[in-house]
Interface confidence: medium
């Protein structure tokens, strides 16, 4: 599984490693894999989540490179809580099949966190 390292408090784009077809307009979803379950990331259904490689006014698509990261999950101001394994799923609009890929995020250099700190929100961009 590919691994991405980021310094604490930096932003990161997690790439979707699913073997996408450039001509299929997938919809992407992200989950963080947890012990005993999954946590679904926020993925608002906007143009930039669509894999049909439009690139209007900064909207991203998989066929073009949105910051060289197709279907990337943008995590801002990372903390140690963000470390872990993430899975992207690309849904074929015709329902024929879903494609998925995993990526490991390691956030380094974070100070010790207080227990009451909660997970940051995520947004795919």
């Amino acid at each position: 599984t590919p691994e991405v390292k980021v310094a604490c408090s930096e932003d990161v784009d997690l790439p979707c490693t699913a073997p996408w077809d450039p001509q299929v307009p997938y919809t992407v979803s992200w989950v963080k894999l947890l012990e005993g379950g999954e946590e679904r990331m926020e993925t608002p259904q906007e143009d930039h989540l669509r894999g049909q490689h439009y690139h209007q006014k900064g909207q991203n698509g998989s066929f073009d490179a949105p910051n060289e990261r197709p279907y990337s999950l943008k995590i801002r101001n990372t903390t140690s809580c963000n470390s872990g394994t993430y899975r992207c799923t690309l849904q074929d609009p015709d329902g024929q099949r879903n494609l998925s890929g995993k990526v490991i995020l390691r956030v380094t250099g974070c100070p010790a966190q207080r227990k009451e700190e909660t997970f940051k929100k995520y947004r795919a961009e």
Partner: antibody, heavy 115, light 109 residues
Framework: EVQLVQSGGAVVQPGRSLRLSCAAS????????MHWVRQAPGKGLEWVAA????????YYADFVKGRFTISRDNPKNTLYLQMNSLRADDTAVYYC????????WGQGTTVTVSS | MTQSPLSLPVTLGQPASISCRSS???????????LDWFQQRPGQSPRRLIY???NRDSGVPDRFSGSGSGTDFTLRISRVEAEDIGVYYC?????????FGQGTKVEIK
């Protein structure tokens, strides 16, 4: 100025090969998917092939599968279409175009397949 | 993708409209409809006018407008000018593979 300049068109015999080129300028070529679209004489537009921004993913129309190969050289800002086993019905003006929305087009290059 | 009419004689200064019909809905699961319009003037390369049904590309005169939903779409020219003569194509990018309409030839009466 954003521009796609094409070259490589020619008159060739059936069964022969030809390589078309599309040189990009005025934008960051390596971050855009690219397409080839063709237009037979007096006919409409027909999508041919596409390649993702990094060249890792390619797709072809059924009528060219196994005969045509799309590729790109990002350091050279150039898109290619290698056409093998050419047939008379491949005769057309071939256009390169930028990204899925086909927002920028080349000037076209004419391929004539004739014996 | 079926366009009509295939030939459209027009009077300069008068409105004109072109229809494009898809055999299946072009509404994508993300809620967007990926239907584009292109203009091809005689002897020139195609040029995109409208993307996603109704969005004009930069530099496209506001006399061009697009509308429609689902399977039926229309390109309208509010007042035809001489430079508008040419062939107009619709193209869908919702479903694989990318497909074009047959083209509508706009010519002066």
């Amino acid at each position: 100025e954003v521009q796609l300049v094409q070259s490589g068109g020619a008159v060739v015999q059936p069964g022969r090969s030809l390589r078309l080129s599309c040189a990009a300028s005025g934008f960051t070529f390596s971050t855009y998917g690219m397409h080839w679209v063709r237009q037979a004489p007096g006919k409409g537009l027909e999508w041919v092939a596409a390649v993702s921004y990094d060249g890792s993913n390619k797709y072809y129309a059924d009528f060219v599968k196994g005969r045509f190969t799309i590729s790109r050289d990002n350091p050279k800002n150039t898109l290619y279409l290698q056409m093998n086993s050419l047939r008379a019905d491949d005769t057309a003006v071939y256009y390169c175009a930028r990204r899925g929305g086909l927002d920028i087009w080349g000037q076209g290059t004419t391929v004539t397949v004739s014996s | 993708m079926t366009q009509s009419p295939l030939s459209l004689p027009v009077t300069l200064g008068q409105p004109a409209s072109i229809s494009c019909r898809s055999s299946q809905s072009l509404i994508h699961s993300d809620g967007n409809t990926y239907l584009d319009w292109f203009q091809q003037r005689p002897g020139q390369s195609p040029r995109r006018l409208i993307y996603k049904v109704s969005n004009r590309d930069s530099g496209v005169p506001d006399r061009f407008s697009g509308s429609g939903s689902g399977t039926d779409f229309t390109l309208r020219i509010s007042r035809v000018e001489a430079e508008d003569i040419g062939v107009y194509y619709c193209m869908q990018a919702t479903h694989w593979p990318r497909t074009f309409g047959q083209g509508t030839k706009v010519e002066i009466k």
